[in-house]
């Protein structure tokens, strides 16, 4: 009888899943640029400051920084350029662009954001002579929303980014942490399955009873992932056991609060090329 | 290589309005760059104008008469001066910078302007 | 507007023989930045004039180093260490800290 494959295919999604935070603070299919221009999206109350930051790889000796909106016919209006700690004269003060100490970062701000700024911005660096040089960032979203009366719950703009270090510092450690917390639980999941290995008895033929609620007890709700397809890749066939579980596992995360969401089909080898959550992927394998 | 050549009448009466273009070669007028106009009056020296570079920005001895455009299409820019006296007879240049200060790489021939009756 | 006074108007100068040309600015071109935003600039007979030096003494690609530039504040120099025959023209000196950017009358440089 071939020996089964155990929680590896388990883990090994886990360590996949365990990159997702660096998806999240840094799209891996926005092109590598010289320049980048953050955050990708930014939301304002009209009236409020709105400030993007620009970032050179390296500070070359002279170049000129210029910062675009792109028009309703996809052509770049320059709103302000920014020499030697110079903004050009001449141009609208709402827009500002100012040198971080580090000299490689800078502010670009709109102060008292106008509903009608409510667009797609960039930035654009020109490396001026003997070794002139034009390159553009990726594209921002900024969005200005008009001003509500209530103060908002969370905090209208998304935090600057996160500088390189600290970055990577986050996503190691928040890999690391999920990773482990993760494989505790699926640790617990597997007992759960594969009672054998803690009971010694072969239990088939039933799933597990949904969760019952005691008279008494606080409301527990489930968020329920679906059904982990696990596709197995024996090499060899394996006889039938007798008293073998079916390929298919069940897990069911537990969130105390929570109003549960509809189950989710996913099968473990289209992990294999996992892309970060898409907006309609919900909130991923955090609550929200 | 850029080359940029200015073209345009040699004279012109006064009180009327100048006009004059500037066709690029050789590279695109885009709002990257400052597309600028300066003249050289004789026995004087050089005296900026304006620029073009997505917008305008221009020398206030000349504001209210003084008008810089661009068609990013014909790949070309252009100068109209209004009410031109004989003071305003000059080489007038159009030139390329890569900052909105007197950091000019490429400019044109000139061409000379004459104002008279 | 900054006026830029150059001294002197025209200068005859022998083959080898060293130049200078004296620029003044009405005021300060030193930036808060640290920088100072002079220029010189040279137009050879029938051609279009083209900048030699930006902020005070860098040269600009292709420009001999018999061409030097110094000075601060408001009083700056361009130096031609030993003038060659293709050197005649006349030189302008330009400011570009505060807009509108202004010229000097310029400099002929003829030789003897």
């Known amino acids: 009888m071939g020996s089964r494959r155990g929680p590896w295919p388990l883990v090994w999604a886990v360590l996949q899943l365990g990159w997702w935070p660096g998806w999240l603070l840094d799209s891996p299919d926005r092109p590598w640029s010289p320049l980048t221009f953050s955050p990708a999206q930014l939301t304002v109350q009209e009236g409020e400051n709105a400030t993007f930051t620009c970032s050179l790889a390296d500070i070359p000796d002279s170049f000129v920084l210029n910062w675009y909106r792109l028009s309703p016919r996809n052509q770049t209006d320059k709103l302000a350029a920014f020499q030697e700690d110079r903004i050009e004269p001449g141009r609208d003060r709402r827009f500002r662009v100012t040198r971080l100490p580090n000299g490689r970062d800078f502010h670009m701000s709109i102060v008292a954001a106008r509903l009608n700024d409510s667009g797609i911005y960039l930035c654009g660096a020109i490396y001026l002579p003997p070794n002139t040089q034009i390159n553009e960032s990726p594209r921002a979203e900024l969005s200005v929303t008009e001003r509500t009366l209530e103060p908002p719950t969370q905090s209208p703009s998304p935090p600057p980014r996160l500088s390189g270090q600290l970055q990577g510092l986050v996503i190691g450690v928040t890999s690391v942490l999920v990773g482990v917390l993760l494989l505790l639980l699926l640790t617990w999941v597997l007992a759960a399955v594969f009672p054998r290995a803690t009971r010694g008895a072969c239990v088939c033929g039933s799933e597990d009873e949904p969760l019952k609620e005691g008279p008494d007890a606080a409301p527990v709700f489930t968020l329920d992932y679906g059904e982990l397809d696990f596709q197995w890749r024996e090499k060899t066939p394996e006889p039938p056991a007798p008293c073998a579980p079916e390929q298919t596992e069940y897990a069911t995360i537990v969130f105390p609060g929570r109003p549960a969401s509809p189950g989710r089909r996913a099968s473990a080898s289209s992990l294999q090329g996992a892309q970060p959550p898409s907006p309609e992927d919900g909130p991923g394998l955090w609550p929200p | 290589d850029l080359t940029l050549q200015e073209s345009g009448p040699g004279l012109v009466k006064p009180s009327q309005t100048l006009s004059l273009t500037c066709v690029v070669s050789?590279?695109?007028?885009?709002?990257?760059?400052?597309w600028n106009w300066i003249r050289q009056r004789p026995n004087r020296g050089l005296e900026w104008m304006g620029y073009?570079?997505?917008?305008?920005h221009y020398n206030p001895a000349f504001q209210g008469r003084i008008s810089i455009d661009a068609d990013t299409a014909q790949n070309h820019f252009s100068l109209q001066l209004s009410s031109m006296t004989t003071e305003d007879t000059a080489v007038y240049y159009c030139?390329?910078?890569?900052?909105?200060?007197?950091?000019?790489?490429?400019w044109g021939q000139g061409i000379l302007v004459t104002v008279s009756s | 507007d900054i006026v830029m006074t150059q001294t002197p108007l025209s200068l005859s100068v022998s083959p080898g023989e060293p130049a200078s040309i004296a620029c003044k600015a009405s005021q300060s071109l030193l930036h808060s930045n640290g920088n100072t935003y002079l220029y010189w600039f040279r137009q050879k007979p029938g051609q279009s004039p083209q900048r030699l030096i930006y902020?005070?003494?860098n040269r600009d690609p292709g420009v001999p180093d018999r061409f030097s530039g110094s000075g601060s504040g408001t009083d700056f120099t361009l130096r031609i260490t030993r003038v060659e025959a293709d050197d005649a023209g006349v030189y302008y000196c330009?400011?570009?800290?505060?807009?509108?950017?202004?010229f000097g009358a310029g400099t002929k440089v003829g030789l003897k």
């Open positions: 073009w570079s997505g917008y305008t």
């Open positions: 030139l390329r910078g890569y900052i909105w200060t007197p950091d000019y790489d490429y």
């Open positions: 902020k005070v003494s």
């Open positions: 330009g400011q570009g800290i505060q807009d509108p950017w202004t």
């Open positions: 050789g590279g695109s007028v885009t709002n990257i760059f400052y």
